[in-house]
């Protein structure tokens, strides 16, 4: 079952997700999506990193941590009730079926 995180309407929500890079800057692609983690990739992607940098995001979604050291925790700004639901953090480790998948449940009060 998903770990549950709470935030209040109008506040920022924080959804933690971490991995350990082989070396700082030697990154593994990560995606964040709205909805449970599918078989591959992320559905409804809101933010993505590649081996170099954060390469895609939409308004209100950003990384507040040191992502080049593996802190890919997602911040969602100024949340509304519509932001409630499951979010997927997927660490896209090279190789077959190596991905680490985390489903996080966001509850907005």
């Amino acid at each position: 079952s998903e770990v549950e995180y709470r935030a209040e309407v109008g506040q920022n929500a924080y959804l933690p997700c971490f991995y350990t890079p082989a070396a700082p800057g030697n990154l593994v692609p990560v995606c964040w999506g709205k909805g449970a983690c599918p078989w591959s990739q992320c559905g409804n992607v809101v933010l993505r990193t590649d081996e170099r940098d954060v390469n895609y995001w939409t308004s209100r979604y950003w990384l507040n941590g040191d992502f080049r050291k593996g802190d890919v925790s997602l911040t969602i700004e100024n949340v509304t009730l519509a932001d409630s639901g499951i979010y997927c953090c997927r660490i896209q480790i090279p190789g077959i079926m190596n991905d680490e998948k985390f489903n996080l449940k966001l509850v907005i009060k």
Partner: antibody, heavy 121, light 107 residues
Framework: QIQLVQSGPELKKPGETVKISCKAS????????MSWVKQAPGKGLKLMGW????????TYADDFKGRFAFSLETSASAAYLQINNLKNEDTATYFC??????????????WGQGTTLTVSS | DIVMTQSPATLSVTPGDRVSLSCRAS??????LHWYQQKSHESPRLLIK???QSISGIPSRFSGSGSGSDFTLSINSVEPEDVGVYYC?????????FGGGTKLEIK
């Protein structure tokens, strides 16, 4: 293509107020922060701070707290720098520069052309 | 604030030379170091990010290296249009300070 277009040169007297604009085009304005950088004549670059274009929350470097204010007109994809109670040492070129919102992504990939401010009595 | 120190202040080179510009941070900033070029009467332009990552549209003769507190910008074969001032920037800790710049001149 992505562009940041700033307002024209300004000549002001000490004690006056100036408001410099930076109009963005070619990308979704609220997905990037906007930074302001000062360059005094013949000197290097100094970051003044930046503004979150989604929330409007500004962050000021210590040397630019008090007389300086960042603001937005989101509907016009525009950011503004206002300097109050102008001093001679405010004479400089001011640049706006695009910054991703992520805390550890602090390179500036697009810059305005600069606005020259001259403060003289 | 982290202090960024660049050397030399001025570099006079001949077209075709390979040159190295140095930048030192007053404390470790990992690889959060960015390089900019500013030509006379122009805005700065991002050349390299994260110490060594290339930027789309920037000629391949520009490269960066280093980590921690010591960094280098290299220009493999200087061309006349490379004249200008080169700035390094601390991208690790606010207020993301810039170095004082290295002025590149052509002999």
């Amino acid at each position: 293509q992505i562009q940041l277009v700033q307002s024209g040169p300004e000549l002001k007297k000490p004690g006056e107020t100036v408001k410099i604009s930076c109009k963005a085009s070619g990308y979704t304005f609220t997905t990037y922060g906007m930074s302001w950088v000062k360059q005094a004549p013949g000197k290097g670059l100094k970051l003044m701070g930046w503004i979150n274009t989604y929330s409007g929350a500004p962050t000021y470097a210590d040397d630019f707290k008090g007389r300086f204010a960042f603001s937005l007109e989101t509907s016009a994809s525009a950011a503004y720098l206002q300097i109050n109670n102008l001093k001679n040492e405010d004479t400089a070129t001011y640049f706006c520069a695009r910054k991703p919102p992520h805390y550890y992504v602090n390179s500036f990939d697009y810059w305005g052309q600069g606005t020259t401010l001259t403060v003289s009595s | 604030d982290i202090v960024m120190t660049q050397s030399p202040a001025t570099l006079s080179v001949t077209p075709g030379d390979r040159v190295s510009l140095s930048c030192r941070a007053s404390q470790s900033i990992s690889d959060y170091l960015h390089w900019y070029q500013q030509k006379s009467h122009e805005s700065p332009r991002l050349l390299i990010k994260y110490a060594s990552q290339s930027i789309s549209g920037i000629p391949s003769r520009f490269s960066g290296s280093g980590s921690g507190s010591d960094f280098t910008l290299s220009i493999n074969s200087v061309e006349p249009e490379d004249v200008g001032v080169y700035y390094c920037q601390n991208g690790h800790s606010f207020p993301y300070t810039f170095g004082g710049g290295t002025k590149l001149e052509i002999k």
